[in-house]
Interface confidence: low
């Protein structure tokens, strides 16, 4: 499975989606954890609601959100005030019993932001969403401030 | 025993909406996923869309896309369709169907609404 | 889309014959198949999910098999209140969940 790198600004959100085949994991939680190191385990950092058909409602554990929208096959991760102790490696699982399938692995690089730099002559200018096979991510423009989606039809 | 009663027959206009609707009972409304499938006179059967009566989140066909909502009042228990800017062509019998949970099969279906269009 | 294509599109059988319904879709569906007997007038009713298994209820002489994009629906030894049309379903690939044409079951 490919590790997918996200980069975002300290300080700001980052959102990841994780999508996943909707009828391969019916029924099933899905979860966002941290690996600790290359081979190490997965910590688990949040999942989704206990009660599978109340997934789609957002779940939070401090600075992280989860929801998972079943339908659509796609689990949303919202890490917000970004610190670079949130840099590192992740993965999206969907769980089943004690079992972990993973969905997408995400390597989430924290990026200062130039606009606290005090000699940026520069403003920052955020590039265009990235999108990438399994996963996605939209950067929020302003500090503090979740773009949110536009909710899935 | 798990029952989806759907409302009566409807005439409609061409250009008009009409609202279809379907009471569960038997069964946890909010437990299944509910579809909708409709069947054109000697035709076969068209999956619709899918509503999940909790969130209620829903997925179209994209034949449908912008002309139909489904929406659910989980306090009856109670799905409905609703197909706008209507043409003859959607004269059928509309299904509402309940999902279980262990396939994505439709195990139970309504009796069926006739929706006739005509000028 | 994906087409699922069903033959024959009728048949005549006799009370006690074997019957075979085949089904195919134009991609993979793993085995994500169902398959609906509807009467006239009345809601299509399911036999059989997930290509192979059978609904509750439904008697044993209703069977089916295939995966991939291949699939079969027998009835061992047609019955008198089996005379129907029958359809497969594909719900793999969401939004575009499909129906095959439907087989009619006539009395021979």
């Known amino acids: 499975l490919n590790t997918t790198v996200l980069q975002g600004m300290a300080g700001q959100s980052l959102r990841v989606s994780c999508t996943y085949d909707a009828l391969k994991h019916w029924g099933r939680r899905k979860a966002w954890c941290r690996q600790l190191g290359e081979e190490g385990p997965c910590q688990r950092v949040v999942s989704t609601h206990g009660v599978w058909l109340l997934a789609f409602l957002k779940k939070r554990n401090g600075s992280t959100v989860i929801a998972d929208d079943t339908l659509a096959g796609t689990v949303t991760i919202t890490l917000k005030n970004l610190q670079a102790g949130d840099a590192g490696l992740y993965q999206c699982q969907s769980l089943r019993g004690r079992e972990a399938e993973v969905l997408q692995k995400v390597l989430v690089e924290v990026l200062e932001d130039p606009l606290d730099d005090q000699d940026a002559g520069d403003l920052w200018v955020p590039e265009e969403s990235s999108s990438f096979e399994g996963a996605q991510v939209e950067h929020s423009t302003s500090r503090n401030q979740e773009t949110s989606f536009p909710p899935t039809s | 025993q798990v029952q989806l009663v759907q409302s009566g027959a409807e005439v409609k206009k061409p250009g008009a909406s009409v609202k279809v609707s379907c009471k569960a009972s038997?069964?946890?409304?909010?437990?299944?996923?509910m579809s909708w499938v409709r069947q054109a006179p000697g035709q076969g059967l068209e999956w619709m869309g899918v509503i999940n009566p909790v969130s209620g989140n829903t997925v179209y066909a994209q034949k449908f896309q912008g002309r139909v909502t489904m929406t659910r009042d989980t306090s009856i228990s109670t799905a409905y369709m609703e197909l706008s800017r209507l043409r003859s062509e959607d004269t059928a019998v509309y299904y509402c169907?309940?999902?279980?949970?262990?396939?994505?099969?439709?195990?139970?279906w309504g009796q069926g609404t006739l929706v006739t269009v005509s000028s | 889309d994906i087409q699922m294509t069903q033959s024959p599109s009728s048949l005549s059988a006799s009370v006690g014959d074997r019957v075979t319904i085949t089904c195919r879709a134009s991609q993979d569906i793993s085995n994500y198949l169902a398959w609906y007997q509807q009467k006239p007038g009345k809601a299509p009713k399911l036999l059989i999910y997930r290509a192979s298994s059978l609904q509750s209820g439904v008697p044993s002489r209703f069977s089916g098999s295939g995966s991939g994009t291949d699939f079969t629906l027998t009835i061992s030894s047609l019955q008198p209140e089996d005379f129907a049309t029958y359809y497969c379903f594909q719900y793999r690939h969401m939004p575009s969940q499909t129906f095959g044409q439907g087989t009619k079951v006539e009395i021979k």
């Open positions: 169907a309940r999902i279980p949970s262990y396939t994505y099969a439709f195990d139970y």
């Open positions: 038997g069964y946890t409304f909010t437990g299944y996923h």
